[in-house]
């Protein structure tokens, strides 16, 4: 399986909410002997490997933001801790999983990584990650809504959402 990042760059105004998304692609074994662990963290573009270093998102570690379930089951972080920090990670039945960050500040700018670990019982773990950049802007040059740039091409999409409202 692979992890796709529909958007490689998110440019958002301060105060906006954004949902960063990853998608599980390829054959996903839904059997009882396979489970998936999914999480999010901040990182840096390392010389050797992007997403190698695991940094917290708003002081929450990848351990705090994880989802754990079978193939395409839906799941949500129910942690009050995450929600108190304006964060929520979620996963749906179609292999999409996301992290929503509310009320963005300039400090939220940086590289974000999603991690999927496939646990095949009695076999090795298989790790795959995706990376995306978040730029939070302020002032007259900031967009009115989040603008997202697809990974495959450089055409941008404007996400129409008002400040402090949840959007995808």
């Amino acid at each position: 399986f692979k992890v796709a990042t529909p958007y490689s760059l998110y440019v958002c105004p301060e105060g906006q909410n954004v949902t960063l998304t990853c998608r599980l692609l390829g054959p996903v074994d839904k059997g009882h002997d396979v489970t998936f662990y999914k999480t999010w963290y901040r990182s840096s573009r390392g010389e050797v490997q992007t997403c190698s270093e695991r940094r917290p998102i708003r002081n929450l570690t990848f351990q705090d933001l994880h989802l754990h379930h079978g193939g395409h089951q839906a799941a949500n972080t129910s942690h009050d801790l995450a929600q108190r920090h304006g964060l929520e990670s979620a996963s749906d039945h179609h292999g999409n999983f996301s992290i929503t960050m509310r009320n963005l500040t300039l400090l939220d700018s940086g590289l974000y990584c999603c991690l999927v670990v496939e646990i095949r019982h009695h076999h090795s773990e298989h790790r795959v990650h995706g990376a995306m950049e978040l730029q939070v802007q302020t002032g007259k040059d900031a967009p009115s809504n989040c603008v997202v740039y697809p990974s495959s091409s450089q055409e941008s999409e404007n996400i129409t959402a008002h400040h402090h409202h949840h959007h995808h």
């Epitope: 002997d33 489970t35 662990y37 050797v48 490997q49 190698s52 351990q63 994880h66 754990h68 942690h79 991690l115 670990v117 646990i119 019982h121 009695h122 076999h123 090795s124 773990e125 790790r127």
Partner: antibody
Framework: QVQLVESGGGLVKPGGSLRLSCAAS????????MSWIRQAPGKGLEWVSY????????YYADSVKGRFTISRDNAKNSLYLQMNSLRAEDTAVYYC???????????WGRGTLVTVSS | EIVLTQSPATLSLSPGERATLSCRAS??????LAWYQQKPGQAPRLLIY???NRATGIPARFSGSGSGTDFTLTISSLEPEDFAVYYC?????????FGQGTKVEIK
């Protein structure tokens, strides 16, 4: 305080049984996989067993398979290792350690000594 | 199972000196390798994860490198509290395995 505390070690005769416990505090125990790792006197570390946050899957090292049983009680924030048919070579300090898929042992207890001797 | 071989078995150095510890895997473990420090009577402590990343709270004098089968832990300038036993551990394949350890002792 984030910690793991093992108990239940002691002296037991070959062929005997012992049940080790590990009490977790300061973190959401039910979020984590857990492992038992042992260290024979003056020797290196050997991974023994692993249990997922929900209690399944479970894995064992070949050296203990069929003799040891790992279990957990998330309501009590506790991890257990039932050790049967003990052998002299099982003599070691047994550590419980916090674990996660795609991660490493980032929190360990202080260990409990198990001595198997006649 | 993957065998991890650490060398040297013992390293005798003085405070302030540079320590270089090696860990070699019997087959590739990609970058899924950690280093731990263990002091007498204490539990091991995670130092480095995924071959080259310092765990939370670990001083910058500790660094890791390598991938595949050959890995190195470097302590740039030994402090008195760094004299201990160091273990590598792989998480690429079941079962998880540890190296036999390298003891860093005061010369």
């Amino acid at each position: 305080q984030v910690q793991l505390v093992e108990s239940g070690g002691g002296l037991v005769k070959p062929g005997g049984s012992l049940r080790l416990s590990c009490a977790a505090s300061g973190f959401t125990f039910s979020d984590y996989y857990m492992s038992w790792i042992r260290q024979a006197p003056g020797k290196g570390l050997e991974w023994v067993s692993y249990i997922s946050n929900s209690g399944s899957p479970i894995y064992y090292a070949d050296s203990v398979k069929g003799r040891f049983t790992i279990s957990r009680d998330n309501a009590k924030n506790s991890l257990y290792l039932q050790m049967n048919s003990l052998r002299a070579e099982d003599t070691a300090v047994y550590y419980c350690a916090r674990d996660l898929p795609g991660w490493y042992f980032d929190l360990w207890g202080r260990g409990t000594l198990v001595t198997v001797s006649s | 199972e993957i065998v991890l071989t650490q060398s040297p078995a013992t390293l005798s150095l003085s405070p302030g000196e540079r320590a270089t510890l090696s860990c070699r895997a019997s087959q590739s473990v990609s970058s899924y390798l950690a280093w731990y420090q263990q002091k007498p009577g204490q539990a091991p402590r995670l130092l480095i994860y995924d071959a080259s990343n310092r765990a939370t709270g670990i001083p910058a004098r500790f660094s890791g490198s390598g991938s595949g089968t050959d890995f190195t832990l470097t302590i740039s300038s030994l402090e008195p509290e760094d004299f201990a036993v160091y273990y590598c551990q792989q998480r690429n394949n079941w079962p998880y395995t540890f190296g036999q350890g390298t003891k860093v002792e005061i010369k």
